[in-house]
């Protein structure tokens, strides 16, 4: 009788992560008597995948009933495949021996390849905010994909970026891979509403790439511009001084009025108006009783924005002249109950 052969008809099998892999194996004879076992890899450190008679293999089922007397089909199914299952699987016939069964013949092996989707890209920006004209770095990471080939693109508001560096790790063979990319983005004053997008394309995604986004509103700081103006109000001895705080982002802002260097009032921006570009405007005003002052008054509007060093703008109020004669023609907008008389 012809010597037993172990036949593994499939040289390779490709399975998507999470699915079931079927590894086929048949023997050409019932002799010699002994079990079939499945291994991943070859040599002394090979991993036992299935032993018909002994051991715990909760993910493995047999295709046919191995207890049938003349069964020669030793195919198995492995459930819930992950990239870690990739490798070459061998169906091995043993003959009964003492004390241990002895390996008799091995199949040629079936290479199991696992296709695994990349994880959703995670985009992260700089830890600290930056101002317009500065260049900031964004990183994009995605993990757990196989095979290694992958494409990553960066976009800002739909426009593809070119200044980025991408690495896929590890460099050599692995069960799964990770991608890491760093893009450089130059900020503009109009970027409060802008978005940076990282797009990952992979064979497992069937042409529907994964995207990760970062809002530049989390990254940008647009410092305010200040303008201090005065005009007469109500009685002739009262002057309305306004401080216009324009085009700032984020909203976190504290304003302090100083009279000849002494703190007069401090307030926090609350009722702001939003510009189309996402920046904010705010105005604070002060009623100054001119008759209470003999000398000229230096009024300073000091603004601390988003924890940054304070910026200020001063205005000299001349007490000697008639208030009406020195008004600015800039209209003041009443935006809240910010009245304060200086006596």
């Amino acid at each position: 009788e012809e010597e037993l052969q172990v036949i593994q008809p499939d040289k390779s099998v490709l399975v998507a992560a999470g699915e079931t892999a079927t590894l086929r194996c048949t023997a050409t004879s019932l002799i010699p008597v002994g079990p079939i076992q499945w291994f991943r890899g070859a040599g002394p450190g090979r991993e036992l995948i299935y032993n018909q008679k002994e051991g715990h293999f909760p993910r493995v089922t047999t295709v046919s009933d191995l207890t049938k007397r003349n069964n020669m089909d030793f195919s198995i199914r492995i459930g819930n495949i992950t990239p870690a299952d990739a490798g070459t699987y061998y169906c091995v016939k043993f003959r009964k021996g003492s004390p241990d069964d002895v390996e008799f013949k091995s199949g040629a092996g079936t290479e199991l390849s696992v296709r695994a989707k990349p994880s959703a890209p995670v985009v992260s920006g700089p830890a600290a905010r930056a101002t317009p004209q500065h260049t900031v770095s964004f990183t994009c990471e995605s993990h757990g994909f196989s095979p290694r080939d992958i494409t990553l693109k960066w976009f800002k508001n739909g426009n593809e970026l070119s200044d980025f560096q991408t690495n896929v790790d590890p460099v050599g063979e692995s069960v799964s891979y990770s991608i890491h990319s760093t893009a450089k983005v130059v900020l503009t004053r109009e970027d409060v509403h802008s978005q940076v997008i990282c797009e990952v394309a992979h064979v497992t995604l069937q042409g529907d790439p994964l995207r990760g986004t970062a809002n530049l509103s989390e990254t940008i700081r647009v410092p305010p511009t200040l303008e201090v103006t005065q005009q007469p109000v109500r009685a002739e001895n009262q002057v309305n001084v306004t401080c216009q705080v324009r085009k700032f982002y984020p909203q976190r802002l504290q304003l302090t009025w100083l009279e000849n260097g002494n703190v007069s009032r401090t307030e926090t921006a609350s009722t702001v108006t939003e510009n189309k570009d996402g920046t904010y405007n705010w105005m604070s005003w002060l009623l100054v009783n001119v008759s209470a002052h003999r000398d000229d008054v230096k009024l300073t509007c000091q603004v601390e924005h988003d924890g940054q060093p304070a910026v200020s703008k001063s205005h000299d109020l001349k007490v000697s002249a008639h208030p009406k004669e020195q008004g600015s023609n800039t209209a003041a907008e009443n935006t809240g109950s910010n009245e304060r008389n200086i006596y």
């Epitope: 008597v33 002394p44 450190g45 090979r46 991993e47 036992l48 018909q52 008679k53 002994e54 051991g55 715990h56 293999f57 009933d65 191995l66 207890t67 009964k96 004390p99 241990d100």
Partner: antibody
């Protein structure tokens, strides 16, 4: 539900023999080996031997070669462990275990005493 | 035969502590064939870890197993009162199948 139901406790005299049984249900009896394991009071586990119910093939721990015999009756899905020339050293709990090592019988307590 | 030596034989730990039990083999055992069991007084052993590092069904995630060759370990990241038991390692790489002497884990 997979079950291995073992026979009840035994009190036997030194020099005698005893046959412990283990009846399987909830799985194909010929699928996997049945092992027998000994545990003396407050001691570790010792592997006695195993049998393949499909063909009766057995393997024994050399330490138990003259002490233990394992057999099966496939018609009743039952495995047996026979212990001979009993001494106080044989006082222990004996477990039958399915080949997957997940399913263990509840154990049979054997006491050897005069 | 392959002799499995477990250490320590007895150990005591407080809830929340990290605990590691070791199992050394007298000759190399492929990890696929190294199992761990938990046994509580009056009960049959339960398969706890199979193939050196895989948790059996129902085993809490605070347990983990690792090792290769002649050195294996079972670790509990944050021990709980219900983990008080004896733990046995076991090889079925070669005949005769053997078990370690066990580690009795007591919780303070």
């Amino acid at each position: 539900e997979v079950q291995l139901q073992q026979s009840g406790a035994e009190l036997v005299k030194p020099g005698a023999s005893v046959k412990l049984s283990c009846t399987a249900s909830g799985f194909n009896f010929e699928d996997t080996y049945i092992h027998w394991v000994k545990q003396r009071p407050d001691q570790g586990l010792e592997w006695i031997g195993r049998i393949d119910p499909a063909d009766g093939d057995t393997k024994h721990n050399p330490k138990f070669h003259d002490k233990a015999t394992v057999t099966v009756d496939t018609s009743s899905n039952t495995a047996y462990l026979e212990l001979s020339s009993l001494t106080s050293e044989d006082t222990a709990v004996y477990y039958c275990v399915r080949g997957n090592y997940v399913n263990w019988g509840q154990g049979t307590t054997l006491t050897v005493s005069s | 035969q392959i002799v499995l030596i477990q250490s320590p034989a007895i150990m005591s730990a407080s809830p929340g502590e990290r605990v590691t039990l070791t199992c050394r083999a007298s000759s190399s055992v492929t990890s696929s064939y190294l199992y761990w069991y938990q046994q509580k007084p009056g009960s049959s052993p339960k398969l706890w870890i199979y193939s050196a590092s895989n948790l059996a069904s129902g085993v809490p995630a605070r347990f983990s197993g690792s090792g290769s060759g002649t050195s294996y370990s079972l670790t509990i990241s944050s021990v709980e009162a219900e983990d008080a038991a004896s733990y046995f390692c076991h090889q079925w790489y070669s005949y005769p199948r053997t078990f370690g002497g066990g580690t009795k884990l007591e919780i303070k």
